[in-house]
């Protein structure tokens, strides 16, 4: 059985490891094992002995029996997936295997899709754990009940003062009010 000595993949990405075997092991079960030592490694996933793909969590294994190779795919890679793994074949007597080192590297924040989901909602607005859900709710409450009325009062007062010095046609007044409101809401959408 032969496989790559080292494979590298990005955090949150995936790697596929291809291991080749002799034709006489075609219908034997294939497996993927984790641990520095061959004798004590932990089997994470096994094939069925057929060509059918098997999935388990972030792992999948597919045996291409015609090509005498099987593929293991590790998805949603994490830093702590970095370890020694083994491609193995289940057979009578001692199983066959070859060692594969998997190295997961960090991807810069700018090239990786980040999530702002946190473990639970918080109420204090602290940046280390504030829930985005709560943030949105608080912002809209503030907008609807405080900022918009305050803005309307302000716009009304300004226009009233303007009107007292010169008569403004009603249509123009409506247009001024709407464009002021639009620009305020747009600014808020850009920077909550």
């Amino acid at each position: 059985i032969q496989g790559p000595a080292l494979v590298r993949g990005p955090e949150q990405g995936s790697v596929t490891v291809q291991c080749r075997y002799s034709s006489r092991w075609q219908t034997n079960k294939k497996w993927w094992c984790r641990g520095a030592s061959w004798s004590t490694c932990r089997v994470l996933i096994r094939s069925t002995g057929s060509e059918k793909e098997t999935k388990s969590g972030r792992l999948s294994i597919r045996d291409n029996q015609k090509n005498h190779s099987f593929q293991v795919t590790m998805e949603m890679l994490r830093q702590n997936d970095t370890d020694t793994y083994w491609c193995g074949i289940e057979k009578f007597g001692t199983d066959r295997g070859t060692r594969v080192k998997v190295n997961v590297y960090s991807v810069g924040k700018d090239t990786m899709s980040t999530s702002n989901q946190l473990p639970w909602p918080t109420v204090d607005g602290s940046t280390d754990m504030v829930s985005s859900d709560l943030q949105k709710r608080t912002y809209y409450m503030l907008l609807v009940f405080v900022k918009v009325p305050a803005l309307l009062i302000l716009v009304g007062a300004v226009l009233w003062l303007k009107r007292s010095t010169q008569k403004v046609p009603e249509e123009q007044w409506r247009h001024t009010l709407c464009s002021d409101l639009d620009s305020e809401l747009l600014a808020k959408d850009i920077s909550p």
Epitope: Q117, P121, T122
Partner: antibody, heavy 118, light 111 residues
């Protein structure tokens, strides 16, 4: 309303693997994180991990690294807990939990009993 | 990790009387004026049920005879007047940081 429905009881032998499912309904699955809590017979509650349902990334408590795997099937709105190389001390009821928009653990699955015995 | 110590481990209270359960944290679970300490009730064969969140706020649908108080490291759950259906185990839990932890539980028996 938010509901979490877990798979049925499991009886396993030491060394075997168990996979428990937790199917969520009544909300957008990726809106809230998912947590797992262990309760051994006659004992208290122990937090195991939380999973970011947007990315599938789990954050483990120290006691639950290694043999425990937490995963998601977002399209099926389901969270999974897999325990490998089962030991007698894994005998417990496992709960999936979500906070929803509450500040405490407001929504619990009914629990899945796992018994490990030779 | 923050350790939560509940006392007493068990108590028996007569119907209509007051039950008081204490929860002490090994370090403060408060931040910016909020205490990330919650109380749960668990009956045999059931999952826990959230009663009180943020130390003193009553969860929707929970009877007003349940109340919580405290801040920093010392918290109390009061049940008054105690009813027969309140026989259960009560747990405090913090989520000030990861990992969140639970108290050891207090078993309430109704006399």
């Amino acid at each position: 309303q938010i509901q979490l429905v877990q798979s049925g009881p499991e009886l396993k032998k030491p060394g075997e693997t168990v996979k428990i499912s937790c199917k969520a309904s009544g909300y957008t699955f990726t809106d809230y994180s998912m947590h797992w809590v262990k309760q051994a017979p006659g004992k208290g509650l122990k937090w195991m991990a939380w999973i970011n349902t947007e990315t599938g990334e789990p954050t483990y408590a120290d006691d639950f690294r290694g043999r425990f795997a937490f995963s998601l099937e977002t399209s099926g709105r389901t969270a999974y807990l897999e325990i490998n190389n089962l030991r007698n001390e894994d005998t417990a009821t496992y709960f999936c939990v979500t906070y929803g928009s509450s500040y405490g653990m407001a929504y619990w699955g009914q629990g899945t009993s796992v018994t490990v015995s030779s | 990790d923050i350790v939560l110590t509940q006392s007493p481990a068990s108590l028996a209270v007569s119907l209509g009387q007051r039950a008081t359960i204490s929860c002490r944290a090994s370090k403060s679970v408060s931040r910016s004026g909020y205490s990330y300490l919650h109380w749960y009730q668990q009956k045999p064969g059931q999952p826990p049920k959230l009663l009180i969140y943020l130390a003193s706020k009553l969860e929707s649908g929970v009877p007003a005879r349940f109340s919580g108080s405290g801040s920093g490291t010392d918290f109390t759950l009061n049940i008054h007047p105690v009813e027969a259906e309140d026989a259960a185990t009560y747990y405090c839990q913090h989520n000030r940081e990861i990992p969140p932890t639970f108290g050891g539980g207090t078993k309430l028996e109704i006399k």
